[in-house]
């Protein structure tokens, strides 16, 4: 999203990013802070009871494509959300609960922010 | 890249425990579950269990849970699995995988990188 | 616990052929099907999860397909580095349980 008045070119990505880090953090991570050459995440799932988690991290560039899909996990909802614009950009994902299906969860798109 | 290493092999005597070990890099190794499964010399395969590195959650295949215990030790990214009251049954490859997507709470099914795996000789 | 059967133990054909394999799962596993690739030395590869999703790496001569209860890994233009056992494997339902394997061979 860009803001009144900024500039269109694109800006490039940083080579390291720093994401926001909750449950997912490295060993090294400083202040649930972590770094990667990926994506910032932010993920959220259903716990056994029906009630929502949300987590956050860092992921490897190398498989990033299929971690920030919604590859269908059964009979349990999950859904997760990427991005690579500035650091700490997962501060602003809010993911949501796929809607419960006959079953269980369909396939869904790759979420980049 | 991923990386899951395992000891080559391990001889011990019938009766006896055992405590296989499977250590991981080049990941974020709290956010993945790790499988371990087995393999009979000449057979299919059999999955044993899967342990969340970040909160010691486990699953047992019913066949195992009084055979084998799951942990993991953080701290060196390494996931353990203990083998008791050892016959010439339980002599067979054993395999750790990491799953394929990342999770917390959820269980997933997908085993997407193998250790080479431990040969366990069961014999006196 | 559910049963999954790979009818064919051994299959042999030539370099360049088309090859499929099959996987029945004994009940309906809403398409959570894996197949894995071991190698004589014993080194398995996750090659297809979601019955048709390839993973990272893996060549797009591999393709895999099925629903219910029936599934099929296809090889296109077998390759020489293609000889290995294949392994389905459903994630369905809990225990995971995996096909007997069937070893392909070079005519």
């Known amino acids: 999203k860009k803001e009144d008045g900024e500039s269109t070119a694109p800006t490039p990505r940083p080579k390291i990013l720093r994401c926001k880090c909750h449950h997912h953090c490295p060993e090294d991570s400083v202040n649930n802070i972590c770094s990667t050459d990926g994506y910032c995440f932010t993920m959220i799932e259903e716990d056994d009871s029906g009630m929502p988690v949300v987590t956050s991290g860092c992921l490897g560039l190398e498989g990033s494509d299929f971690q920030c899909r919604d590859t269908p996990i059964p009979h349990q909802r999950r859904s997760i959300e990427c991005c690579t614009e500035r650091n700490e950009c997962n501060k602003d994902l809010h993911p949501t609960l796929p809607p419960l299906k006959n079953r269980d969860f369909v396939d869904g798109p790759i979420h980049h922010k | 890249q991923v990386q899951l290493q395992q000891p080559g092999a391990e001889l011990v005597k019938p009766g006896a425990s055992v405590k296989l070990s499977c250590k991981a890099s080049g990941y974020t190794f709290i956010s993945y579950w790790m499988h371990w499964v087995k393999q009979r010399p000449g057979q299919g395969l059999e999955w044993i269990g899967m342990?969340?590195?970040?909160?010691?959650?486990?699953n047992y295949n019913e066949s195992f849970k009084s055979k084998a215990t799951l942990t993991v030790d953080k701290s060196s990214s390494t996931a353990y699995m203990q083998l008791s009251s050892l016959t010439s049954e339980d002599s067979a490859v054993y395999y750790c995988?990491?799953?394929?997507?990342?999770?917390?709470?959820?269980?997933?099914?997908?085993?997407?990188?193998w250790g080479q795996g431990t040969i366990l000789t069961v014999s006196s | 616990d559910i049963q999954m059967t790979q009818t064919t133990s051994s299959l042999s054909a030539s370099l360049g052929d088309r090859v499929t394999i099959s996987c029945r799962a004994s009940q309906d596993i809403s398409n959570f099907l894996n197949w894995y690739q071991q190698k004589p030395d014993g080194t398995i590869k996750f090659l297809i999860y979601y019955t048709s999703r390839l993973h990272s790496g893996v060549p797009s001569r591999f393709s895999g397909s099925g629903s219910g209860t029936d599934y099929s890994l296809t090889i296109r233009n077998l390759e020489q580095e293609d000889i290995a056992t294949y392994f389905c494997?459903?994630?369905?339902?809990?225990?995971?349980?995996f096909g007997g394997g069937t070893k392909l061979e070079i005519k």
């Open positions: 342990i969340h590195p970040n909160s010691g959650s486990t």
């Open positions: 494997q459903q994630g369905n339902t809990l225990p995971y349980t």
């Open positions: 995988a990491r799953d394929l997507l990342i999770a917390t709470v959820v269980v997933t099914p997908y085993f997407a990188y």
